[in-house]
Interface confidence: low
């Protein structure tokens, strides 16, 4: 089955610059299929823009200004690229790539879409680092004792733009866990968001990861925030002497990392 | 030019109660086109649900039914037993892929219908309230309550900032909520919740500490293994102290 990945969750540009949006095709040979690009402007219907067929033929929707959009494909990387020249306010939209995927039965086809890339146009000069800054919250003892479950909370602050995706996984598992999240909130010129995961008692002794996708993540890779295992009988940790206290005392350990 | 027009901009549905979305075609006979339905969820993911006839996306067959009303020139999508996962914007779209003559392989979309999911009417349930802390940050976790109306107060004399609560449907079909704030005296912050004309206070097993107990280990480059920031000898922390281990990465 064909699968489409748009690695850029968002693409922030200043006016008149060029935006290049990528779409990676897997499960199907890109040179044996057509790739379509659609855009969804705020408050408008999703509209077909341009396609590139298996033989390289480009088809543009009528009414689309010539020279505005360029579509290409690179078989070696199984990637289709939509280039938007001279970006302006009316180009603000979410751009989706898509392809027709044949079903097993005769004549049955469906069009599958990539997750979309949001094109953002800004005139702001932003701080050097506008990647999401994480803070983690571990389960309350009251919750683990009373409800035989624990909630992890992942707070992300001081990021720009507002487009962000958060999901949770157990360590050594690719299964995405069912989590909940708040709305993205504006704080001055940046944004914040939080997500939380409630796990049953039997999963508290596993390491959990809050995985964050954002345009400005360091090196362009997903940020992984590790939530250490919680032992429900006794918790053993491995800190340096100056981190430990007598076992009967309260230990409030706060780890800070400015390089996230 | 043809146009696909959803019957409603927003459709509130209750968990477990069947709901029907309709989308009419203007300017053409709907029978000349294939109708498709898609759902866009938070994060813009566009997921295929249904295409004429009887083609369903993975996981949609048991809970969705697509149909065409030729006489009324409209497409119908029925959600048989809505759950909180079904919240999102639903789009009808048409194409003529594989039809005779001048067929088109592009999709023509209608505007979306926003489906909001509410728990079905049920007995009132009071929340459980828990506090989670890290540095100046405090989160008040409010679990499994019904109905939705709630006031969450983080009680402190030294507020820096507070955020609007997030209220979501819980997997069991009630509500969960989280309210976040930043406080100079986070150790003394408690949470109280007004629900159904009653007040519920956070359940507190934690022993209070003052800020001199904060241990700040040296910074580490490795966000993936924060527990290794303090190098090696052992400390044993009993369960009662679990919440006091907070990490800012």
């Amino acid at each position: 089955a064909g699968h489409l990945e748009q690695p850029q969750i968002s693409s922030t540009k200043t006016l008149s610059k060029t935006a290049r949006l990528e779409c990676v095709v897997s499960g199907i040979t890109i040179s044996a299929t057509s790739v379509y690009w659609y855009r969804e402007r705020p408050g408008e219907v999703i509209q077909f823009l341009v396609s590139i067929s298996y033989d390289g033929t480009v088809r543009k929707e009528s009414g689309i200004p010539s020279g505005k959009f360029e579509v290409d494909r690179i078989p070696e990387t199984s990637t289709s690229t939509l280039t938007i020249h001279n970006v302006e306010k009316q180009d603000i939209a979410t751009y989706y790539c898509a392809l027709w995927e044949a079903q097993q039965e005769l004549g049955k086809k469906i069009k599958v879409f990539g997750p979309g890339t949001k094109l953002i146009i800004t005139d702001k000069q932003l701080d050097a680092d506008v990647s999401p800054k994480p803070t983690i919250f571990l389960p309350s003892i009251a919750e683990t004792k009373l409800q035989k479950a624990g909630t992890y909370l992942c707070l992300l602050e001081k990021f720009f733009p507002d487009v962000i995706k958060i999901h949770w996984q157990e360590k050594k598992s690719n299964t995405i866990l069912g989590s909940q999240e708040g709305n993205t909130m504006k704080t001055n010129d940046t944004y914040m968001k939080f997500s939380w995961l409630t796990v049953p008692e039997k999963s508290l002794d596993k390491e959990h990861r809050c995985i964050v996708r954002h345009e400005n993540n360091k090196n362009g890779v997903d940020q992984e925030i590790i939530f250490p295992p919680i032992k429900t009988d006794v918790i053993t940790m491995d800190p340096k002497d100056n981190c430990s206290k007598d076992a009967n005392d309260t230990l409030l350990l706060q780890l800070t990392n400015t390089s996230a | 030019a043809i146009e696909l027009v959803p019957e409603h901009q927003t459709v509130p549905v209750s968990i477990g109660v069947p709901a029907t979305l309709r989308c009419s075609m203007k300017g053409e006979a709907i029978g000349n086109y294939y109708i498709n339905w898609y759902r866009k969820t938070q994060g813009n993911t566009m997921t295929f649900i249904y295409r004429e006839k009887d083609i369903y996306g993975p996981g949609f067959k048991d809970n969705f039914q697509g149909d065409i009303d030729i006489a009324k020139n409209l497409a119908v999508l029925k959600i048989l037993a809505p759950s909180e996962r079904d919240e999102g914007s639903y789009y009808c779209a048409c194409d003529t892929l594989g039809m005779g003559g001048e067929y088109t392989d592009k999709l023509i979309f209608g505007k979306g219908t926003r489906v909001t999911v509410e728990p079905r009417s049920q007995p009132h349930t009071k929340p459980s309230v828990f506090v989670m802390k890290n540095g100046t940050n405090v989160a008040c976790l409010v679990k499994e309550f019904y109905p939705k109306d709630i006031r969450i107060n983080l009680v402190s004399s030294k507020k820096i900032t507070e955020f609007d609560p997030a209220i979501v449907i819980s997997p069991s079909g009630k509500y969960n909520a989280v309210k976040l704030g930043k406080y100079e005296d986070s150790n003394s912050v408690t949470c109280s919740v007004q629900h159904d004309n009653k007040t519920v206070h956070s359940t507190d097993f934690e022993v209070k500490t003052d800020s001199t107990d904060h241990v700040k280990p040296k910074e580490t480059e490795n966000t993936k293994q924060p527990s290794k920031s303090c190098h090696k000898p052992k400390a044993i922390v009993h369960t009662e102290k679990v919440n006091m281990m907070s990490l800012t990465v």
Epitope: Q104, E105, L106, G107, K108 | A29, G31, N32, Y34, E52, K53, D54, I55, Y56, K61, Q65, D67, I70, A71, K78, T96, G98, M99, G100, G101
Partner: antibody, heavy 118, light 110 residues
Framework: EVQLVESGGGLVQPGGSLRLSCAAS????????MNWVRQAPGKGLEWISY????????YYSDSVKGRFTVSRDNAKNSLYLQMNSLRDEDTAVYYC???????????WGRGTTVTVSS | QSALTQPASVSGSPGQSITISCTGT?????????VSWYQQHPGKAPKLMIY???NRPSGVSYRFSGSKSGNTASLTISGLQAEDEADYYC??????????FGGGTKLTVL
């Protein structure tokens, strides 16, 4: 092997009832709309009924509406046609047919013969 | 719903081309692109030859083609062969959510 096999035909008196079955094999039955088509001796094909995958949508031709009932059991990979109040003009070979996408039939059974006669 | 109109019979010599017409109304053939053609040999079940006006299922010879103009659909068989001798039926979806067949055309290869 991908196939449809009809059964249940036979001789029946006018006003009587009969239940036809169609067993599907070799493909995912639950993902296809199914139809019944009949052919009177020496005559042409006549479509009589359609049922969608989930049984949500059902259509009948005017000639059988109110007398015939189509149903399916996806767990058993089976299609059924309950025929009541049978008439002489219902005498025909009855075919079940799989719908390819939108009103075309890409797989047919070999048919079962129904004779209505006193 | 009355049947679509087809000629009762057509004939042609091997190697020739023949066309079978199928005439309906704006409520069926003219209104929708859901016209199919079936071939039926005596004592056998029908076989799909053309779907959605002009599409050929895999396994059907390229000699069979379909088209439509207004309320009339056509099946053309080029390079006629002996094994093409059979009955041919057209069908169309109708505005009353039913399917209607043509009366059938007997093709004789001379």
């Amino acid at each position: 092997e991908v196939q449809l096999v009809e059964s249940g035909g036979g001789l029946v008196q006018p006003g009587g009832s009969l239940r036809l079955s169609c067993a599907a094999s070799g493909f995912t039955f639950s993902t296809y709309g199914m139809n019944w088509v009949r052919q009177a001796p020496g005559k042409g094909l006549e479509w009589i009924s359609y049922i969608s995958t989930s049984s949500y949508t059902i259509y009948y031709s005017d000639s059988v509406k109110g007398r015939f009932t189509v149903s399916r059991d996806n767990a058993k990979n089976s299609l059924y046609l309950q025929m009541n109040s049978l008439r002489d003009e219902d005498t025909a070979v009855y075919y079940c047919a799989r719908e390819g996408d939108w009103w075309y039939f890409d797989l047919w059974g070999r048919g079962t013969t129904v004779t209505v006669s006193s | 719903q009355s049947a679509l109109t087809q000629p009762a019979s057509v004939s042609g010599s091997p190697g020739q081309s023949i066309t079978i017409s199928c005439t309906g109304t704006s409520s069926d053939v003219g209104g929708y692109n859901y016209v199919s053609w079936y071939q039926q040999h005596p004592g056998k079940a029908p076989k799909l030859m053309i779907y959605e006006v002009s599409n050929r299922p895999s396994g059907v010879s390229y000699r069979f083609s379909g088209s439509k103009s207004g309320n009339t659909a056509s099946l053309t068989i080029s390079g006629l062969q002996a094994e093409d001798e059979a009955d041919y039926y057209c069908s169309s979806y109708t505005s009353s959510s039913t399917l209607v067949f043509g009366g059938g055309t007997k093709l004789t290869v001379l």
